[in-house]
Interface confidence: medium
C-alpha cells in the first residue's frame, strides 16, 4: 500500500507568491510559493494519485504583514481552502498567547491540529480541551494512519505560551501515545512535529513504532540529487535513520517559507512496516500557476493590508537616526530603538533568579536602512518600518560563548570607516574600541548586562560562558562576514518579523525618544 | 455553479416562531462563513445574522438578538435561522447570503453570492 | 453602530451618461466598502469590494473610489441593465448598509 506524503513547515505568513530568496515579490516571473500556486501542484497530485495526506509541521505563524493584520484568521482560511489534513503546533503559534491560538485557528481549523507533549493544566485545560490533539487517526483510502504531533519543549522561551501549558520532552511524551495508536490497530504512523531537526531524527531512533517523521523548525533543506535553487540540501531525502530497533526510518523536511512542497512516496506491507521511501521537495516556481480562485481570494483578504500600512502605529519625538552615515560608524538611536524593541520581544520567563532570560542584542548597521523624520506630525507607520527595515527578515535567538562574541566585535570595526555593513548596534551591551589598535585587537572593553540578576548591572563579558543573544536572522547565518556566529552558534531558534517586533514595541510605548547613551564608544 | 436555496418562509402571527433554512450547493459549504441579511417591502437592506465556518462564532443584529439564532449543519451543506418572538416588524424578504466572520471576527467578508430569498409575514 | 448614508436617495440619468452615487460613513471604515446592485424582484449583486476591486463578471464601467469615510460608486456611461438600486455597505464592524440609492430613467 503506497502513501503520498505532501508537507510544509514553517511557513511563516507567506501567503502570498515571494521572490527566491522568500521575501516580497518584485518580479512575478520570477516568483515562487504562495498558497495560490501550492494548491495547484497539491490538487494535481491529489488527481494522480490514490492515497494523499498533506501536511503540515508548524510555525504557519508570524513573519509578515499577513500575520500582523489577520493574526491567524488567514491561516486558518487558506489551510481549510487547500484542505490540509493535519497540522502540527509549532512554536510560533504561541506569539499572540494562548487565546491567539485558540481564536483564529483552533476553532476555525477544519483539520486536527495536534501535539502530544504539550499538556494543559488549571483553567486553561477545560477551555482548550479538544481543541488540539495528541493524535489523530486519518482515514486514506481503504486505510487509516496515525499521526502524531510534538512541539519544542524550548516554546515557553521562544513564545509566549503562558503559564498553563506545560511542554515535556518529546520522546517521553511521544511513546505512550504511539503505543494507544498501536493498540488501536493503528500501524502506519506518522511522527509530525515542530522540534528541529536534530530531535526529529532522535524521534526517528528512540520512539518504537514510528514509521515516518514529517519535522519543522530548524527549515532543513534534503535533497537527493542537484538542488533546484540556492538552497544547499543539509542530506538526502528523505534522510534515512536506522532506529534503535533496527528498522529504517525516513526523516524529512521542506526548507521554509512555502517555497517548496516536500513530496514523499512510502511504501507499506500489509503490517504496517515501511518497504521503500522515495521522494523530494518540489521547488513551487513560476512554471506552476497560481490557482485563480485562491489568487482572487488572496487578492480580496490583500485589501485590508494595504490599509494598515499606512496607519499610525505610535510617535516618536525624536528624529530616528537610520542613516548609513550614522549607524555604520557609531552608536545611532535608530539601532538602539530596534534593540530596545528585541530584547522587549523577548521578555519572558523570568524567575527568583533570573529577571529575564536574555539581555543581549546585536544589530548590524548596514541592516538599518533609513532614518524616521519626526517632523512629520511624529507619525510612524508600518510604510515608515518596512523602508527601515525592507529585507522581511527575522529577530532571532541564539546561544553563544563569550569568545564568539568578542570575535564578533572585534569583526565589527576591523574595517573601520569604510561605511561597511558590519558595524554592530546594540542593546544589553556596553562596548570600547581602540581603533588605533590593529584589526582583530581594537575592543578594549565589552560589558554585558546581567540576566541572573534582580538589579540589571553591566559585568565583564567571560569568554567561556555561554550567553543567549537576540540578533537578525540574517547575522545567526554569517551574513556581512559573521562565520563565527554561523560556526560557533550553539542553539539558534528562529524568532518574529522585525518589522512586527518594532511596531509591537511601538505601539506598546505609544510615544518614543530614543536617545544614543553611550551603548558604543 | 454557487447556488443559496432559501426556505420555510410565510404567514405567522406575532409571538410566533419560524425556522429558515438555506441549502448550499456548488463550493465547499463548510470553508466558508454565511449570514443571513433582510429586507422589508419597499425598504432598505439589513443585516441580521453571520455565522464562522465551523459555527465557533455567531453574530447578531441589535435588533434581533436574543430572538433569533443562526446554526449551521456542515454535514448537510445547510443554513438555518431560527426565528422565535417574531413582531410585525419582523416582516421582510430574508436571504441566505455566502460571506461573513473569519478567525473570530478579525476579518468580515462581503457576500458575493446571494440567494433568491424567502418572504416571512408576520402579521395577524 | 456605523452609520452609512448614501446620497441621492434617487438619481435620474439619460442611457450613456455618466452615473455619481456617494456613500457617507459615521466613521473610518478604511477600504472595508462594498457595492452592491439590486433589481425589482431579485437579490442584490455584489458589484465592488474593497472600495474599488470589482467583483467577478462586473463591467469596466462600474467604479468605486474612497476610503475612510467618503466613498463613491461611478457608472461611466449608463446601459439599460444598470437602472437599478445600489446600496453601499460597510463590513469593517459587523455589517451596515446604507438607505439605497435608485437610479432611473430620465
Known amino acids: 500500500w503506497e502513501l503520498t506524503i505532501l508537507h510544509t513547515n514553517d511557513v511563516h505568513s507567506r501567503l502570498e507568491q515571494t521572490s527566491e530568496d522568500s521575501s516580497k515579490c518584485v518580479n512575478a516571473s520570477r516568483c515562487m510559493g504562495g498558497v495560490a500556486r501550492l494548491f495547484t501542484k497539491v490538487q494535481q497530485i491529489r488527481r494522480a494519485e490514490p492515497n494523499v495526506l498533506l501536511l503540515d509541521a508548524g510555525d504557519q505563524y508570524q513573519g509578515t504583514i499577513w500575520f500582523t493584520v489577520y493574526k491567524g484568521a488567514e491561516v486558518a482560511h487558506f489551510m481549510n481552502a487547500l484542505r490540509y489534513d493535519a497540522m502540527a503546533l509549532g512554536n510560533h503559534e504561541f506569539d499572540n498567547g494562548v487565546e491567539g491560538l485558540i481564536e483564529p485557528l483552533l476553532k476555525e481549523a477544519k483539520f486536527p491540529i495536534l501535539s502530544a507533549n504539550i499538556k494543559a493544566k488549571g483553567p486553561l485545560a477545560s477551555q482548550i480541551s479538544g481543541l488540539y490533539l495528541p493524535y489523530k487517526v486519518l482515514p486514506v483510502g481503504d486505510e487509516v494512519v496515525g499521526i502524531v504531533g510534538y512541539t519544542s519543549k524550548e516554546t515557553p522561551f521562544l513564545s509566549n505560551p503562558g503559564t498553563n501549558l506545560v511542554f515535556e520532552d518529546e520522546i517521553t511524551a511521544l511513546q505512550p501515545e504511539v503505543d494507544k495508536l498501536k493498540t488501536l490497530n493503528v500501524n502506519k504512523i506518522i511522527a509530525l512535529g515542530h522540534s528541529g531537526f536534530e530531535t526529529d531524527k532522535l524521534i526517528a531512533q528512540k520512539v518504537r513504532g514510528v514509521d515516518v517523521v514529517v519535522g519543522g523548525h530548524s527549515n532543513t533543506f534534503l535533497y537527493t540529487g542537484n538542488p533546484p535553487s540556492k538552497e544547499v540540501p543539509a542530506g538526502k531525502y528523505p534522510f534515512i535513520v536506522t532506529s534503535d530497533d533496527g528498522r529504517k526510518v525516513p526523516v524529512v523536511q521542506a526548507y521554509a517559507f512555502g517555497k517548496y512542497l516536500g513530496y514523499l512516496k512510502i511504501e507499506f506491507d500489509e503490517r504496517g512496516n515501511v518497504i521503500s521511501s522515495h521522494g523530494n521537495p518540489i521547488l513551487l516556481n513560476s512554471s506552476i500557476p497560481e490557482d485563480p480562485s485562491i489568487k482572487a481570494d488572496i487578492n480580496k483578504w490583500r485589501i485590508k493590508l494595504d490599509n494598515y500600512s499606512t496607519q499610525e502605529l505610535g510617535k516618536t519625538i525624536v528624529y530616528l537616526d537610520g542613516s548609513s552615515q550614522s549607524c555604520r560608524f557609531r552608536e545611532c538611536n535608530m539601532g538602539n530603538l530596534i534593540c530596545d524593541a528585541m530584547i522587549n520581544n523577548n521578555l519572558r520567563h523570568a524567575d527568583e533568579m533570573f529577571w529575564n532570560h536574555v539581555s543581549m542584542c546585536i544589530l548590524n548597521g548596514g541592516g538599518i536602512r533609513s532614518p524616521i523624520d519626526e517632523r512629520n506630525n511624529g507619525t510612524i507607520t508600518w510604510e515608515n518600518l518596512a523602508a527601515v527595515l525592507p529585507f522581511g527578515g527575522t529577530f532571532d535567538l541564539v546561544q553563544l560563548k563569550g569568545s564568539t562574541l568578542k570575535k564578533a566585535f572585534e569583526h565589527s570595526v576591523h574595517r573601520y570607516g569604510q561605511s561597511t555593513g558590519e558595524f554592530l548596534q546594540v542593546g544589553g551591551i556596553h562596548v570600547v574600541y581602540d581603533l588605533s589598535r590593529k584589526p582583530g585587537d581594537r575592543v578594549v572593553k565589552l560589558d554585558v548586562l546581567c540576566t541572573k540578576c534582580r538589579v540589571p548591572s553591566y559585568d565583564p563579558l567571560k569568554m567561556d560562558e555561554i550567553y543567549k543573544v537576540i540578533l537578525p536572522n540574517f547575522l545567526a547565518n554569517g551574513g556581512d562576514g559573521f562565520q563565527m556566529i554561523k560556526d560557533e552558534l550553539l542553539r539558534h531558534d528562529s524568532g518574529d518579523q522585525d518589522i512586527n517586533v518594532v511596531s509591537t514595541y511601538i505601539s506598546k510605548m505609544k510615544v518614543i525618544y530614543p536617545a544614543v547613551e553611550g551603548r558604543i564608544k | 455553479e454557487v447556488q443559496l436555496l432559501e426556505s420555510g418562509g410565510g404567514l405567522v402571527q406575532p409571538g410566533g416562531s419560524l425556522r429558515l433554512s438555506c441549502a448550499a450547493s456548488g463550493f465547499t459549504f463548510s470553508n466558508l462563513a454565511m449570514s443571513w441579511v433582510r429586507q422589508a417591502p419597499g425598504k432598505g437592506l439589513e443585516w441580521v445574522s453571520a455565522?464562522?465556518?465551523?459555527?465557533?462564532?455567531?453574530y447578531y443584529a441589535d435588533s434581533v438578538k436574543g430572538r433569533f439564532t443562526i446554526s449551521r449543519d456542515n454535514s448537510k451543506n445547510t443554513l438555518y435561522l431560527q426565528m422565535n418572538s417574531l413582531r410585525a416588524e419582523d416582516t421582510a424578504v430574508y436571504y441566505c447570503?455566502?460571506?461573513?466572520?473569519?478567525?473570530?471576527?478579525?476579518?468580515?467578508?462581503?457576500?458575493?453570492?446571494w440567494g433568491q430569498g424567502t418572504l416571512v409575514t408576520v402579521s395577524s | 453602530e456605523i452609520v452609512m448614508t448614501q446620497s441621492p436617495a434617487t438619481l435620474s440619468v439619460s442611457p450613456g451618461e455618466r452615473a455619481t452615487l456617494s456613500c457617507r460613513a459615521s466613521?473610518?471604515?478604511?477600504?472595508?466598502l462594498a457595492w452592491y446592485q439590486q433589481k425589482p424582484g431579485q437579490a442584490p449583486r455584489l458589484l465592488i469590494y474593497g472600495a474599488s476591486t470589482r467583483a467577478t463578471g462586473i463591467p469596466a464601467r462600474f467604479s468605486g473610489s474612497g476610503s475612510g469615510t467618503e466613498f463613491t460608486l461611478t457608472i461611466s456611461s449608463l446601459q439599460s441593465e444598470d437602472f437599478a438600486v445600489y446600496y453601499c455597505?460597510?463590513?469593517?464592524?459587523?455589517?451596515?448598509f446604507g438607505g439605497g440609492t435608485k437610479v432611473e430613467i430620465k
Open positions: 455597505q460597510q463590513y469593517t464592524n459587523h455589517y451596515t
Open positions: 466613521q473610518s471604515v478604511s477600504s472595508n
Open positions: 447570503a455566502r460571506g461573513g466572520p473569519y478567525g473570530s471576527g478579525s476579518y468580515w467578508d462581503t457576500f458575493d453570492y
Open positions: 455565522i464562522s465556518g465551523r459555527a465557533t462564532s455567531t
